[in-house]
Interface confidence: low
């Protein structure tokens, strides 16, 4: 009763909201809401009524399973969806699904904040630029990941000849997608073509 399930999907995809258990037998009414009280669709007396909402034309209810199919979800569809079932006994039962719709992350741009030749060493400060997104960062030097402590939008490192990597990759990811950006250096400490 009222158990909250989390779902994360990519924007533009088609989504099925459903519960893991079977519906109560011979229920009287089934209603899907978004937020607390905004009706999307109601099944009653063997027919479905679709309400005027941003979902109209994008949703379909399967009364058999209670599943709600939403096509082409967008970030604006982020919400807690509630399925309420009125049982023959008159009792109400509800299930909640918190839907998070994420855009695919854009390709990041690596900005060279500082590149400095210090005797045979190279001081490097790179930032991974991505517009206003909450993402995870992973840095790679020649496809080898940097330690986890360095996993944020800025990579700051001093390169010595014995551990010198030519190319640096920033991978940005969220739970639905990931993209890479790469810059390459020419020894000892100059920018090469990406």
């Amino acid at each position: 009763q009222g158990h909250l399930v989390h779902m994360t999907v990519v924007s533009g995809s088609n989504v099925t909201l459903n519960i893991s258990e079977s519906l109560p037998e011979n229920y009287k009414q089934l209603t899907w809401f978004y937020t607390f009280d905004q009706k999307i669709v109601e099944w009653d007396s063997r027919k479905s009524k679709y309400f005027e909402s941003k979902f109209k034309g994008r949703v379909r209810l399967d009364p058999q399973s209670g599943a709600l199919y939403i096509s082409k979800v967008q970030k604006e569809d982020n919400s807690t969806y509630i399925m309420r079932v009125l049982k023959k006994t008159g009792n109400e039962q509800e299930w909640k699904i918190k839907l998070q719709v994420l855009d695919p992350v854009p390709k990041p741009v690596i900005k060279i904040e500082k590149i400095e030749d210090m005797d045979d060493n190279c001081y490097l400060k790179l930032s991974c630029v991505i517009p206003g997104e909450s993402v995870n960062y992973t840095w790679y030097g020649d496809k080898r990941p940097f330690p986890k402590e360095l996993q944020n939008s800025v990579l700051e490192t001093t390169l010595m000849p014995h551990n010198y990597s030519r190319c640096y990759t920033c991978q940005v990811s969220n739970s639905v997608s990931s993209k890479n950006g790469t810059v390459c250096l020419s020894p000892p400490c100059t920018l090469a073509r990406s």
Epitope: G2, D37, N91
Partner: antibody
Framework: EGQLLESGGGLAQPGGSLRLSCAAS????????MSWVRQAPGKGLEWVSL????????YHADSVKGRFTISRDNSKNTLYLQMNSLRAEDTAVYYC???????????WGQGTLVTVSS | EIVLTQSPGTLSLSPGERATLSCRAS???????LAWYQQKPGQAPRLLIY???SRATDIPDRFSGSGSGTDFTLTISRLEPEDFAVYYC?????????FGQGTKVEIK
Amino acid sequence: EGQLLESGGGLAQPGGSLRLSCAASGITFGRYAMSWVRQAPGKGLEWVSLISGSGGSTYHADSVKGRFTISRDNSKNTLYLQMNSLRAEDTAVYYCAIYNNYNWFDPWGQGTLVTVSS
Amino acid sequence: EIVLTQSPGTLSLSPGERATLSCRASQSVSSNYLAWYQQKPGQAPRLLIYDASSRATDIPDRFSGSGSGTDFTLTISRLEPEDFAVYYCQQYGSSPRTFGQGTKVEIK
């Protein structure tokens, strides 16, 4: 037709607490979403809190969020509003109402007056 | 949130006259999800109209609702003595549910 009767109103100090009750009769209480709506003296109506029939979902107006808690006991056919950290601006008649099909409010109780004053 | 503005604030009329009350929304009310209530002094509100134009149970047919989008009207075709009261509109097209500030219909 269902009837609703509120109780628990009275005088409270600023910062104090009150618990309102709403006893329902003549309806299958657990089937209905319920609401509290308030009306300050000489003013209009303001929706305060909502609760689903099962009690599984609650929702509060921003003006009372974190201070008021709506709950229900379907076995006792009773709706509650726990009001903490009361302010002078909470002074109002508090009505309980059936939140009919999650749309409009009907029927309403007769209301209980809450006065917050030192 | 949707703000509902009712006009006029007070309407002074005689029994038998026609009353026209206005409710204007700050943005379009989805699917005309608007209700009207009547409240007499010392009493709880009573539902008159829902879905902008549907009369609630036991409401006399002298009460009618109309309008769409942002402009809604409650009409009382011939005022009876018991109709003098305050009338509120309420939208349920979006959350939070909001009420207008009320129109008082008083005896002239």
